[in-house]
Interface confidence: low
């Protein structure tokens, strides 16, 4: 027992004064705890304790399970102990079977033994099976096996607790390992979709996949700039030893317009930390935003093609789209596609293909979109470029020399005069009338100018030329003059 | 599916015997201790017999010490219970257990039989 | 040996209910209780172990405390399944249940 110096308080005597004692199962066990300041017996094996206020524990009978620890603690809080063995040859290992071992880390198998005196205390496998080669383990009578630097490769392993008692081999219960794996790697995590898009009152809800190789990875939902605690729904599962799954599910049942940010999926192990986000945008209605992708005012000349093409962006889905040119529906030459295939996707084109446009097609071409909660459209103006045609060229009674062309854009008409019989003319005629006949009238279309000159100023035989031009084209008219004495004599224009 | 399935039970005379299996499946039973529980008719569990897995050893209710013993054959998935000198008071449902550890020699039975009736009467 | 307690043998509840069933022990059995459901002509089903852990698959409106000789068993909030008798059984010393409680409809 401990000796200390006069004045100091010293730990308690135990007798028998042993550290050490064997007792034959069904004998009794006795120890006295000599302290003026007494305070209890404590017995610990495995994870069991028992406490006793006398100071003699008596146990009249002795089973193998009363071995163990048996401390003897006095008021000032210093100890002294005495291990015990009860020897049952029938119980020589006590068991607890829970084997648990981290991975890279030693572990204890739990089996002390009851008779100290045996030889041979070692693990060995089940059903005569090996140990593997690199398991290294270290044998302690009163605490059990401990098994150093687990692996990962030991993960279900059965064993037993040997001992050779009276040249025979005992074995335990057995034991099955379950190792703990160590985080090599931070979590892999996932989110069902990068972005939502809801409207109040609907139902948000968000998916998070963990994959880790155990089920201690620690993993959960926040809202960015805010500490509310959100609540989450788990499942999970092991796909294997080392293969763990958990799907945290966050759920709004009834969405608002503050509800609107980002949320991050975080999870971390004891290797490091690893985070994915979703954005939540909830709007007050749906809505529908349309983008021309040409301009709204189209030019295009006589025959030629065009494409109106539009982008909008609709939620919910689009339910209805359609083109209209003069109050009249379009149900080919049209087709409407989503920009993407994901399905969060909000965004939408839509084409309308005009061939060969003649001049009389020029107008407002209308695209409508329409969803659960609003409808939108956008019109095109669209011009069709036409060479001016010469419709009426005319001497009338008056003695004036008319030409009305039609064109778009609007034709200018030049008069020429050209003496003899010279067809190329160049002497500019200033009119004496010009007019733009469907100015006030529809908006597209042709324009028809009326152009009128005194023929009265030309004294000599000649042609008159009309010519009506615009950016498209240009277009002649003539008018030939014979003189016969004073008299003037028109022959029939000609273009 | 883990399953453990009674048999053997019937009417005898008192004093007669009567042998009750328990045929285990879907689990690794020779990898477990095993215990018969009974109940006799409008009255509660009572522990009868226990034994460890490889069938070294076992334990037994007062009662029953001497007159019940308790086996299994590993090869077979099946446990027995082999009831001689049978009396009145033995008249009961008995189930078959599957008995599980947690921490030292501590107990709890966590997978069990339909049950088997066994009626001791004249 | 052992003997094991309940109180009440027998309770009428309503679905909803917060329900608590008692078992005392003759002597400490330090944590070593063990709780079971048992419905009429039906094996006995493991709820508790080790006093209050949970055996996979039962719900956590079911839950045991205590330690040394007395010990709990609680259901939060009756449910028409939960119907039943209850059974403790201590696993200190070989193995003794208790005498059982009914949990019948008020």
């Known amino acids: 027992q401990p000796s200390v110096s006069p004045g100091e308080p010293s730990p308690p005597s135990i007798h028998p004064a042993k550290s050490e004692l064997i007792v034959r199962v069904g004998n009794e066990i006795r120890l006295l705890c000599i302290d003026p300041g007494f305070v209890k017996w404590t017995f610990e094996i495995l994870d069991e304790t028992n406490e006793n206020k006398q100071n003699e524990w008596i146990t009249e009978k002795a089973e193998a399970t009363n071995t163990g620890k048996y401390t003897c603690t006095n008021k000032h809080g210093l100890s002294s102990s005495i291990y015990v063995f009860v020897r049952d040859p029938a119980k020589l290992f006590l068991v607890d079977r829970s084997l648990y071992g981290k991975e890279d880390n030693d572990t204890l198998v739990r089996c002390p033994l009851t008779d100290p005196e045996v030889t041979s205390y070692s693990l060995k496998g089940c059903q005569g099976k090996p140990l593997p080669k690199d398991l290294r383990f270290v044998p302690d009578p009163k605490a059990g096996i401990t098994i150093k630097s687990v692996k990962r490769a030991y993960h279900r392993l059965c064993l037993h607790c040997s001992a050779d008692q009276e040249g025979k081999s005992v074995l335990s219960d057995k034991f099955i390992l379950k190792v703990r794996p160590a985080f090599k790697a931070v979590p892999v995590v996932s989110v069902s979709k990068a972005s939502y898009l809801l409207r109040e009152g609907e139902e948000f809800t968000v998916t998070c996949t963990i994959k880790d190789v155990s089920s201690s990875v620690y993993s959960t939902w926040k809202r960015e700039n805010s500490q509310t605690k959100l609540q989450e729904k788990y499942n999970s599962w092991h796909h294997g030893d080392f293969n763990y799954e958990r799907q945290a599910t966050l759920t709004i049942s009834s969405a608002r317009v503050n509800d609107s940010g980002v949320f991050m999926c975080y999870a971390n192990n004891t290797f490091g930390s690893a985070n994915v986000t979703t954005t939540l945008e909830v709007v007050d209605k749906g809505f529908i935003n349309i983008f021309p992708m040409i301009n709204t005012t189209v030019f295009v000349n006589d025959g030629e093609n065009v494409d109106l093409i539009v982008e909008y962006e609709a939620f919910p889905k689009p339910e209805h789209q359609q083109w209209i040119y003069m109050n009249r529906t379009f149900t080919d030459k049209w087709e409407d596609y989503p920009k993407s295939e994901n399905e969060s996707n909000i965004r939408y084109v839509s084409e309308l293909h005009l061939t060969r446009l003649k001049g009389t097609e020029g107008g407002t071409y209308t695209f409508l979109v329409s969803n659960s909660d609003v409808n939108a459209s956008i019109a095109f103006n669209v011009y069709v470029n036409t060479k001016p045609e010469i419709l009426t060229y005319d001497r009338l009674v008056n003695g004036m020399l008319q030409c009305v062309a039609a064109g778009f854009p609007e034709p200018t008409i030049d008069w020429y005069f050209c003496p003899g019989t010279e067809q190329r003319c160049s002497a500019s005629v200033l009119p004496v009338d010009v007019q733009t006949l469907n100015a006030s009238g529809p908006p597209f279309g042709k324009l028809v100018v009326q152009s009128s000159i005194d023929s009265s100023a030309f004294k000599h035989n000649g042609t008159v030329e009309c010519k009506a031009y615009n950016d498209v084209g240009k277009t002649s008219a003539y008018f030939n003059f014979a003189f016969k004495g004073n008299n003037k004599e028109q022959i029939h224009p000609h273009t | 599916e883990v399953q453990l399935v009674e048999s053997g039970g019937g009417l005898v005379q008192p004093g007669g015997s009567l042998r009750l299996s328990c045929a285990a499946s879907g689990f690794a039973f020779s990898g477990y201790y095993m215990a018969w529980v009974r109940q006799a008719p409008g009255k509660g569990l009572e522990w009868v017999a226990n034994i460890n897995y490889p069938g070294s050893s076992t334990y037994y209710l007062d009662s029953v010490k001497g007159r019940f013993t308790i086996s299994r054959d590993n090869a077979k998935n099946s446990l027995y219970l082999q009831m001689n000198s049978l009396r009145a008071e033995d008249t009961a449902v008995y189930y078959c257990?599957?008995?599980?550890?947690?921490?030292?020699?501590?107990?709890?039975?966590?997978?069990w039989g339909q049950g088997t009736t066994v009626t001791v009467s004249s | 040996d052992i003997q094991m307690t309940q109180s009440p043998s027998s309770l009428s509840a309503s679905v909803g209910d917060r329900v608590t069933i008692t078992c005392r022990a003759s002597?400490?059995?330090?944590?070593?209780l063990n709780w079971y459901q048992q419905k009429p002509g039906k094996a006995p089903k493991l709820l508790i172990y080790y006093t209050s852990r949970l055996q996979s698959g039962v719900p956590s409106r079911f839950s045991g405390s205590g330690s040394g000789t007395d010990f709990t068993l609680t259901i939060s909030s009756l449910q028409p399944e939960d119907f039943a008798t209850y059974y403790c059984?201590?696993?200190?010393?070989?193995?003794?249940f208790g005498g059982g409680t009914k949990v019948e409809i008020k």
């Open positions: 257990a599957r008995g599980d550890y947690y921490g030292t020699t501590y107990w709890y039975f966590d997978v």
């Open positions: 002597q400490s059995i330090s944590s070593y």
């Open positions: 059984q201590q696993g200190r010393r070989l193995w003794s």
